[in-house]
Interface confidence: medium
């Protein structure tokens, strides 16, 4: 074909085996750096696209991307990922090729996409399509779908990127009652990318593949309904896409909507209106806002203003790095046995995170709920009342966060006993721990109800056996003779519990046991 | 990708303790769960327990508890497991594994090649 | 503890023939959390199938598993020489983890 320019397309690893390229059916270890990564011409309507071999980079790893070029002259050219431009200097080498590279230093997932180099050179223009994999150490991915808009209509895509490839779903509810977060009649599902019909209440689109679901909601400032008791606020990071719908709804046609930034209008083409007339004849009018790719100057108070109703703000920040809020210190629970009580973690995150709650070496499925607040809260309720340490586990793309609680389940002690030839001792479990009393039992004292004073030592928690602690008592033979009967007993709020002792036996010989509740 | 090494085969006697290193390379190491599963010769896994190194937290199963002990190193990407008071019956080949999620866990996805220990008088 | 029985002990098949193994847990296994394993002999087990039914990284995709609950199985739509082996299932949702007796998977 010899009206396609002859383009080399060239992977440099920064690491040994640190990436590897390949058809995605079965990826090639890289051994030596450079690798060609085979660039292979497709024809399209807006014009040619070279597709490389797909590149797995491990986590952490460093590559760069190169396109060589062997037609000379000048040549301008644009990285594309996710949407955002990135910038392009080609240089030329001493066989007067052009060279255009792209490094990604300490790949971290977020850096796995599609890479685009549109290059522009007096032969022609052309595009090279660049695959990067990060060689997660999970098994699979999922990441939160995202809306763009497409092209020449007024309609939204949802692009959702995982491992294997999810599939997408809108979710759209139009009723205003709580029946939108069930699965209730209000709710339509459509299992298609692009979405026409913008006017729903509750639009969210979700993404699905083995690893789970994810889900993204249209951020919607309603102007009929009451304001939040606090600013509804929304994150996003460099880069991302923002999309913000106001909806409105009046009797007639006669009202308009706009949307300023900082009590400045947005510019044209950075938004778009629709309208229809709902079955009571009323009219419903939205407009959407949208940027491609946000930057820093994006941050401030986006306010809906309509002719015809009171207006509503909501704060957009725009980050440079996720974050996950909350309070990461130990908590401590004292149940009883048969209480129903759950672990809760309110909390602020973004991007959302994928959690756990953890105990024992098992993990449960965590569940998150937002709040008016612009919090979330995540309750674990199925710990069977087992006493233990439980963990709470966040992550997302930029952070993690753990917070550990211990859970007590208050139970009643029970003595087990054991005499050796110098010393009785008692040893206990039971929660509070449990304190310990010892008893002489004698011919003035057949209840055994006189105290032991001196000789006795405790010692706490020794270990601590699935959540449970154990306490013990010695009592040193010397103090108390031998000879007699002697009965060790460990009390709590839940009750008490003895063991009766004969003191001259060497072995453990422990023959009675009371249980005074 | 990561690996785990474990260390080499160690013959014990009865009553004596052993104790088995597990060492990852590539990876991330301290939130990921790493289990120890034994198999005694022409038997089947048996899970003796586990840790997060990341939270410290150790896991034993019942018939272990008080004779093993599962520890981490996070800075050289090692974990331990050492058996006490062993007997003849505790002859077997000993995996270290490690779980398949970050900060959870989940199914061993990476096995260590095995340690055999034998017990023998 | 929660115990999985697998059954049979053992299957005498030919290549090219259907699998199909059982793991049955005592009590219900928390959200699914089971996996499967292949073990060949003087080698480590290998991941087959985690979740019950999510296929690790680089398993044909002639390895399948279903079930839920109590019931679980694996099925190995047509057995290819590689695949003569024992299987194990186990259960990591609540505390302690623990395995199944194993299926040995022998050539008929």
């Known amino acids: 074909n010899q009206d396609l320019p002859v383009i080399k397309c060239v992977l440099i690893s920064h690491e040994n085996n640190g990436s590897s390229a390949g058809k995605p059916s079965s990826y090639r270890m890289v051994r030596g750096s450079p690798e060609d990564l085979q660039c292979t011409p497709r024809r399209q309507s807006e014009g040619t696209v070279y597709e490389a071999a797909t590149v797995e980079v491990a986590e952490s790893g460093s590559i760069t991307l190169q396109v060589q070029l062997a037609t000379p002259g000048d040549l301008s050219c644009l990285w594309v990922f996710k949407h955002s431009s990135l910038g392009c200097q080609p240089h030329f080498d001493l066989q007067n090729r052009g060279i255009v590279s792209m490094a990604i230093l300490n790949v971290t997932e977020t850096q796995a996409g599609e890479y685009l180099l549109h290059i522009q050179s007096e032969a022609a223009n052309y595009t090279v399509l660049f695959t990067v994999n990060v060689r997660d150490t999970q098994l699979y991915v999922l990441r939160r779908p995202y809306f763009r808009k497409m092209e020449n209509q007024d309609a939204l895509l949802c692009i959702s990127e995982g491992v294997p490839e999810p599939t997408v779903e809108w979710v759209l509810c139009s009723s205003h009652r709580e029946s939108c977060k069930e699965e209730g009649p209000a709710v339509v599902r459509k299992e298609e990318k692009v979405l026409h019909e913008l006017f729903g209440t509750d639009i969210r689109c979700c993404a699905r593949n083995a690893l789970g679901r994810e889900s993204t909601k249209l951020f919607t400032i309603d102007l009929n309904q009451a304001p939040q008791s606090t600013l509804p606020q929304l994150f996003l990071k460099v880069g991302e896409p923002l999309w913000i719908r106001c909806k409105a709804i009046h009797v007639n046609h006669g009202f308009g909507l706009t949307w300023e930034l900082e009590d400045k209008a947005l510019e044209e083409g950075s938004y778009f209106e629709m309208s229809t007339y709902s079955t009571n004849r009323t009219m419903i009018r939205i407009l959407l806002a949208f940027v491609s790719s946000v930057g820093r100057n994006d941050t401030g108070y986006y306010t809906c203003s309509s002719s015809k109703h009171p207006s509503q703000s909501a704060l957009v920040t725009i980050l440079e790095k996720g974050f996950i809020n909350a309070t990461s210190s130990q908590e401590e629970y004292e149940i009883d046995p048969y209480e129903k009580f759950c672990f809760s973690v309110r909390f602020k995150a973004y991007p959302r995170i994928r959690c756990t709650w953890i105990f024992s070496q098992a993990s449960f499925p965590c569940e998150q709920r937002g709040l008016e607040d612009g919090y979330s809260i995540s309750k674990f309720c199925d710990h069977k009342n087992k006493p233990g340490e439980y963990i709470f586990y966040a992550e997302n793309d930029d952070a993690q966060f753990t917070k550990m609680f211990t859970l007590n389940i208050r139970k009643k002690p029970q003595v087990l006993a054991n005499a050796s030839a110098s010393q009785a001792s008692c040893s206990s479990d039971g929660y509070p721990l449990p304190s310990w009393t010892w008893k002489k039992c004698s011919d003035k004292s057949p209840n055994c109800t006189e105290e032991i004073p001196e000789g006795v030592w405790n010692k706490k928690a020794n270990r601590k056996v699935f959540g449970q602690w154990v306490s013990s008592s010695t009592l040193n033979m010397s103090e108390a003779g031998k000879g007699l009967l002697v009965k060790c007993c460990a009390y709590n709020s839940m009750g008490t519990s003895c063991e009766t002792i004969f003191l001259n036996s060497p072995g453990p010989f422990p023959f009675i046991q009371d249980n005074i509740s | 990708q990561v690996q785990l090494v474990q260390s080499g085969a160690e013959v014990k006697k009865p009553g004596s303790s052993v104790k088995v290193s597990c060492k990852a390379s590539g990876g991330t190491f301290g939130s990921y769960g790493i289990s120890w599963v034994r198999q005694a010769p022409g038997q089947g896994l048996e899970w003796m327990g586990g840790i997060i190194p990341i939270f410290g937290t150790v896991t034993y199963a019942q018939k272990f508890q008080g004779r093993v002990t599962i520890t981490a190193d996070e800075s050289t990407r090692t974990a331990y497991m050492e058996l006490s008071s062993l007997r003849s019956e505790d002859t077997a080949v000993y995996y270290c594994a490690r779980d398949s999620w970050s900060g959870a866990t989940g199914a061993s996805d990476t096995w260590g090649q095995g340690t055999l220990v034998t017990v023998s008088s | 503890e929660i115990v999985l029985t697998q059954s049979p002990g053992t299957l005498s098949l030919s290549p090219g023939e259907r699998a199909t193994l059982s793991c049955r847990a005592s009590?219900?296994?928390?959200?699914?959390?089971l996996a499967w394993y292949q073990q060949k002999p003087g080698q480590a087990p290998r991941l087959l199938i985690y979740?019950?039914?999510s296929r690790a990284t680089g398993i044909p995709d002639r390895f399948s598993g279903s079930g839920s609950g109590t019931d679980f199985t694996l099925t190995i739509s047509r057995l290819e020489p590689e695949d003569f082996a024992v299987y194990y299932c186990q259960q990591y949702g609540s505390p302690p983890r623990t395995f199944g007796q194993g299926t040995k998977v022998e050539i008929k």
């Open positions: 979740g019950a039914s």
């Open positions: 009590h219900s296994v928390s959200s699914s959390y």
